[in-house]
Interface confidence: low
């Protein structure tokens, strides 16, 4: 999906209002120094591409992210403010429906969520630079 035509201001507002809080809740109990932040993005569409990949792409190391509250809100936000995004996600949604409920947050997901926080912060920074 090409994120070029998204309403970045609205996405930023949704992130600051709800998604960020859910991400931070997920990371509670870990120190900000626990994980090196390495994932980067160069502009707003690129940041959203990376955010989508780390939030929704399947990884055997970390099974449960797509079912987390922050992931659901991210999906809703992208569907709302990125034209045509929801259509591209139908197959992904069907695949996730097959997923069984995971019970525990393993620390192997924490690295990924830590990177997500970094990507969102980068997204906000690139937004501020453009204004």
């Amino acid at each position: 999906y090409d994120f070029t035509n998204c309403d970045f201001q609205k996405i930023e507002a949704d992130y600051l209002r709800t998604i960020s809080k859910d991400l931070i809740t997920y990371m509670s109990g870990t120190k900000s120094t626990d994980f090196n932040n390495t994932v980067s993005c160069s502009n707003r569409p690129h940041c959203l591409t990376e955010i989508q990949s780390l939030t929704f792409n399947p990884t055997p190391r970390c099974a449960s992210l797509a079912k987390e509250m922050f992931a659901r809100k991210t999906k809703a936000t992208l569907a709302l403010w990125c034209p045509g995004y929801s259509e591209t996600q139908i197959n992904a949604t069907q695949a996730m429906k097959k997923a069984r409920k995971s019970k525990v947050t393993t620390n192997k997901c924490l690295e990924q969520v830590s990177q997500l926080l970094g990507l969102w912060r980068r997204f906000i920074r690139t937004l501020l630079k453009k204004q």
Epitope: T38, V39, P60, A99
Partner: antibody, heavy 121, light 112 residues
Framework: EVQLVESGGGLVQPGGSLRLSCAAS????????MTWVRQAPGKGLEWVSS????????YYADSVKGRFTISRDNAKNSLSLQMNSLRAEDTAVYYC??????????????WGQGVLVTVSS | DIVMTQTPLSLSVTPGEPASISCRSS???????????LHWYLQKPGQSPQLLIY???HRASGVPDRFSGSGSDTDFTLKISRVEAEDVGVYYC?????????FGGGTKVEIK
């Protein structure tokens, strides 16, 4: 162009050491897990080691555990494999590959040209 | 550890004819997240391997649509609908469900 270029191979005596390097270009290196795969002459592919994008998690095949060390320098877009206590059975072409993480389901979607390591007296 | 077994060991195919390679895992490759961690690679003579299919059935970028993957749990198949001369090489399946990741022994495809 997305590219991985390995270096550091060569002939080494049993018990010796060698350090393989992999230079990445054409993509945001720090966003990807990286993996070393090897192929003994005339044989199939064998997974050696993987490292996550932030180096938080590192995995080794039992055959190299305790002897090989994988590391990465995201600032320099480079991946390394330090190989100690080398044995004849470590003789192989070593491939640097991109993947093992959230992209393409952990598959290895980019491969280097490979570098030959020969362990012989 | 998960053991991957490929059959046949080698395959001789007439150009334009279909070909099929089987890969079996010693345990299910279905993850709790609903995805199945089975991938296919092709190593052409004198070249590095290249990704063909990931997550059972998704074609990698630039891979012709004559290649298709199918299967579930422990049994998987790579099909080439019409073999071309450039398809010769060794085909490998790989599981990335759990470490140690493992490859099948390979299937050598040649042209008759």
């Amino acid at each position: 162009e997305v590219q991985l270029v390995e270096s550091g191979g060569g002939l080494v005596q049993p018990g010796g050491s060698l350090r393989l390097s992999c230079a990445a270009s054409g993509f945001t290196f720090s966003n990807y897990d990286m993996t070393w795969v090897r192929q003994a002459p005339g044989k199939g592919l064998e997974w050696v080691s993987s490292i996550t994008f932030a180096s938080s998690y590192i995995y080794y095949a039992d055959s190299v555990k305790g002897r090989f060390t994988i590391s990465r320098d995201n600032a320099k877009n480079s991946l390394s494999l330090q190989m100690n206590s080398l044995r004849a059975e470590d003789t192989a072409v070593y491939y640097c590959t991109r993947g093992g993480g959230a992209y393409h389901g952990g598959s290895l979607d980019v491969w280097g040209q490979g570098v030959l390591v020969t362990v012989s007296s | 550890d998960i053991v991957m077994t490929q059959t046949p060991l080698s395959l001789s195919v007439t150009p334009g004819e279909p070909a099929s390679i089987s890969c079996r895992s010693s345990q299910s490759l279905l993850h709790i997240n609903g995805y199945t961690y089975l991938h296919w690679y092709l190593q052409k003579p004198g070249q590095s391997p290249q990704l063909l299919i990931y997550l059972v059935s998704h074609r990698a970028s630039g891979v012709p649509d004559r290649f298709s993957g199918s299967g579930s749990d422990t049994d998987f198949t790579l099909k080439i609908s019409r073999v071309e001369a450039e398809d010769v090489g060794v085909y490998y399946c790989e599981q990335t469900l759990q470490t140690p990741y493992s490859f099948g022994g390979g299937t050598k495809v040649e042209i008759k």
